[in-house]
Amino acid sequence: TPEVWVQVRMEATELSSFTIRCGFLGSGSISLVTVSWGGPNGAGGTTLAVLHPERGIRQWAPARQARWETQSSISLILEGSGASSPCANTTFCCKFASFPEGSWEACGSLPPSSDPGLSAPPTPAPILRAD
């Protein structure tokens, strides 16, 4: 069954700046990735970025830089200042649409004992499976 993993990291240099990395482990051709915060996309969450493999990338504040890392993973850097900046317990969600297979979403937040600058494991909890 396809899996989506989400990794949230606080930057050591800017303590209110976050990097979100998401990846898809499954079959099909990724046709769209949606990154949101505050909950799942379409269920109270606010869209931060939409990445399309051909039509390009759209992002909204406080997203600073969204990019493809590989054909099946993305990263997003968030600005750390202003009223709309994330806090330590913010939930980030990534939804991958894979043609012609389906779409799957997983969410994650900063690990409770997160040491800024130290990266979490490549596929940290939580991983949400579509079982």
Epitope: P2, S27, G28, S29, F99, P100, E101, G102, S103, W104
Partner: antibody
């Protein structure tokens, strides 16, 4: 694992319409799109289109855009394909599939007067 | 639409033999190719996804590979239940298209 149960064989007259179903066991499609595929007797497979059960979004093969209508009933976790203006060319076996991995057993459609 | 040319359309082979089936794509599809198996009663099962990844529960005698625009399904040692139909499908772009199929027959 998603198990898909398709409706039984149907015999209809030319010009009529038919609606076949594809029921997901366990009350969930588990994120998978429902694809519909046509297999004419002794021939290869043709992709008709897909529907996203989560929001009803569709993607049709242009060849079948005016022939097929894909819908889903989330409450019963059942996908439907309606075929209209039937001719003998539509006599085939029709499969639904969860993505490309979980396949229904097929529904045989016979169009005959 | 992307055309998938599958060969041979039928193949006679013996138990224990190694066979390869091929699909050629009319344009670049990357690794976006799956292989399906269809039994005489119509049951369809996916064997390989993304050119070379084996689906769970599929015997290790099945493998997939690519050379340029040619994609192969290889069965290393044929068993009796392998003498059925096989199809490739590409999903690099919509619409999904299938190869014409290969009927594997026992010699």
């Amino acid at each position: 694992e998603v198990q898909l149960q398709q409706s039984g064989p149907v015999l209809v007259k030319p010009g009529a319409s038919v609606k076949m179903s594809c029921k997901a066991s366990g009350n969930t499609f588990n994120g998978y799109y429902v694809n519909w595929v046509k297999q004419s007797h002794g021939k290869s497979l043709e992709w008709i289109g897909l529907i996203d059960p989560s929001n009803g979004g569709t993607n049709y093969n242009q060849k079948f855009k005016d022939k097929a209508t894909l819908t889903v009933d989330k409450s019963s976790t059942t996908a439907y394909m309606e075929f209209n203006s039937l001719t003998s060319e539509d006599s085939s076996v029709y499969y639904c599939a969860g993505g490309t991995v979980y396949w229904g057993q097929g529904t045989t459609l016979t169009v005959s007067s | 639409d992307i055309q998938m040319t599958q060969s041979p359309s039928s193949l006679s082979a013996s138990l224990g033999e190694r066979v390869s089936l091929t699909c050629r794509a009319s344009q670049d599809i990357g690794n976006n190719l799956n292989w399906l198996q269809q039994e005489p009663d119509g049951t369809i099962k996916r064997l390989i996804y993304a050119t070379s990844s084996l689906d769970s529960g599929v015997p290790k005698r099945f493998s997939g590979s690519r050379s340029g625009s040619d994609y192969s399904l290889t069965i290393s040692s044929l068993e009796s239940e392998d003498f059925v139909d096989y199809y490739c499908l590409q999903y690099a772009s919509s619409p999904v298209t299938f190869g014409g199929g290969t009927k594997l027959e026992i010699k």
